[in-house]
């Protein structure tokens, strides 16, 4: 089962109310990067997995959930240094003996190929080229995600150009 990711879209014409009001836009907050329907924030500091999870929560977001191989590739393309890796929202559930996304869904065998041990206290991180498991207590960078949000800007029609 893949992590469920809400998709949002907006009909530009439907939301155009006045010529002096800009259409609703799907925007990412400042410092966040847009990747299709998500906003991603790549941390600059390092933390154990649990602290990374908590940090994303304080930002009203979650650790990155990866839906499929395409999304993995798109995310990895944003990692410009092959020597830096990031925690994502996937860890090993000892009770269920399976990799589990933080939204409660389980890793499909076709989604990601994880290099490393599947055992207690293992969490997953991604690099530019690979996906690894590591002790959750290891201090690494991390990626938070949130959905695109609607932002309404009132501006003059000239600024539409």
């Amino acid at each position: 089962q893949k992590p469920s990711i809400g998709k949002c879209s907006v009909d530009i014409q439907q939301n155009r109310t006045k010529t002096t009001e800009r259409p609703d836009l799907l925007n990412c907050p400042i410092y966040w990067q847009q990747v299709q329907e998500k906003c991603l924030l790549f941390s600059h500091t390092v933390n154990p997995w649990n602290n990374s999870l908590a940090d994303c929560s304080t930002k009203e977001s979650s650790l990155l959930l990866i839906q499929d191989k395409d999304e993995l590739t798109r995310t990895q393309n944003l990692i410009h240094d092959k020597a830096i890796s990031f925690w994502i929202g996937l860890n090993f559930s000892l009770s269920e003996k399976n990799w589990k996304w933080i939204n409660g869904s389980f890793l499909s065998s076709n989604d990601l190929k994880i290099t490393g041990d599947a055992k207690e206290n293992s969490c997953v991180y991604i690099s530019q080229t690979s996906v690894y498991s590591e002790y959750c207590s290891t201090e690494m960078k991390w990626i938070c995600q949130k959905e695109l949000t609607l932002v309404r800007n009132k501006v003059s029609p000239d600024s539409w150009l």
Epitope: T45, P48, A83, I84, S85, E134, T138, M140
Partner: antibody, heavy 122, light 108 residues
Amino acid sequence: QVQLVESGGGLVKPGGSLRLSCAASGFTFAQYYMSWIRQAPGKGLEWVSYISPSGSTIAYADSVKGRFTISRDNAKNSLYLQMNSLRAEDTAVYYCARSLMATGTHLYFDLWGRGTLVTVSS
Amino acid sequence: DIQLTQSPSSVSASVGDRVTITCRASQDISSWLAWYQQKPGKAPKLLIYAASSLQSGVPSRFSGSGSGTDFTLTISSLQPEDFATYYCQQVTSFPPYTFGGGTKVEIK
């Protein structure tokens, strides 16, 4: 300038103690795993100890466990190695080394200091 | 502990030669291997990590290959500054992070 500078080496009698220091500059010290690695005269390299960025995770080689203590002060950009109950076989150049950030506890050492010589002899 | 055996222990070569150094691990270490260069009186320098990734700033004449237990460092065209001792290092998650015994590349 990105660099590591060790200090504190010297001549000490067997059973004695020394405290090595490593001053880091030019990078965000608090984000990196740091290690001590040693090299006996004319010999190969031996990893001694590592410490995680926050200092919460530490590991030692069996040869120094119970005798050496690694620590760090991120506010001072400094790494330390307290060496007690020193033996003749601890004689070596001690290097402070930074690990690549990416690789968790898979410690590849991408930045090294010049080393400080510790001689244990009566 | 995982043991690393380097061969040869020394090699004599000329400028322009292709030099190959091997490192064998006592058990499977996947691709968790690095190569370092050390010159007399100097600290080691990271050349290759993750078995085949070239460290930033290292000339492309250096390359690494292998996985599992058998690894190779190749210098495609030896330069005067390449005469040094080379060490492999395994970095599986569990310490200790052992080094090979070294291979000295000397001028023929």
